[in-house]
């Protein structure tokens, strides 16, 4: 039975040209995290594997930085980076947990972080 929950940074905004940290946290389970995939819509950005470390997809390698922790740092943001991001936790023996973050990249300097929320 899957008992865990994913906490994410929720809806966030950032300025064009700036950077943002995408963070998810898995709690309420003793399952072992074997891998975390970071996806934007249906495109894989990065993998953090417990044994193999980080794999950043080549088209993002120049502006995606691994971490902190299992999170992902997006740099040199453009308005095209606006959209949904997913953290997909592969765990053993539970299976897969998914968290969602919505990022809005703003032209203006008015960019405030949204509230944290949970996805069961």
């Amino acid at each position: 039975m899957m008992t865990g929950t994913i906490e994410t940074t929720g809806n966030i905004s950032a300025e064009k040209g700036g950077s943002i940290i995408l963070q998810c946290h898995l709690s309420s389970t003793t399952a072992q995290v074997t891998q975390v995939n970071w996806e934007q819509q249906d495109q894989l950005l990065a993998i953090c594997n417990a044994d193999l470390g980080w794999h950043i997809s080549p088209s993002f390698k120049d502006r995606v930085a691994p971490g902190p922790g299992l999170g992902l740092t997006l740099q040199s943001l453009t308005v095209n980076d606006t959209g949904e991001y997913f953290c997909i936790y592969h765990t053993y023996p539970d299976g897969t947990y998914t968290g969602r973050i919505f990022l809005e990249v703003l032209e203006s300097s008015v960019a405030e972080h949204g509230a944290r929320f949970q996805i069961p």
Partner: antibody, heavy 119, light 106 residues
Amino acid sequence: EVQLQQSGAELVKPGASVRLSCTASGFNIKDTYINWVKQRPEQGLEWIGRIDPANGDTKYAPKFQGKATITTDTSSNTAYLQLSSLTSEDTAVYYCPKSGDYGWYFDVWGAGTTVTVSS
Amino acid sequence: DIVLTQSPASLSVTPGDSVSLSCRASQSISNNLHWYQQKSHESPRLLIKYASQSISGIPSRFSGSGSGTYFTLSINSVETEDFGMYFCQQSNSWLTFGAGTKLELK
């Protein structure tokens, strides 16, 4: 065309070390990850380890810790595998595949380098 | 390490036959399973990634399925150029390969 060119066959004595090279063309190795895979005669494939040429970060299969050292020279777009304290168990073909764009699978392989350890 | 068990060890077929090769993982690996073909004296060639995703340039007669611990590579109507070794590889933890299935001419 994306290719990986490997160095020629090596005949080495037990106890010695050897360094194999893998030169990329058609892409910049800093944009991907270079792996090394061992295949002994009539046997399966064994992953040795990988390197991120952009920062030199390496990971090795536990079995090859202390046996293998992976390095790169980004100026020549080349990756290297050094094997130390060679024994007959190290006689094998060594391949350098690059990781795929979306994970730890191998989409382009070098032709392989045969290493023979014999006195 | 995660152990991948391939079966059968060898398979004799006639061109035109359709075949299924099996790869079983010692623990769940989600869809982190990839398939390769290796012909004699050649390097391996990627056929399928992530259990079922096709690879550009690979004939459509090759397909993959499965998730968790059980995976299958199917070849629909084998051609003479398909004979050789087939290996599965997992990327859920330290990378490991199966021992292979040899596809040979009957």
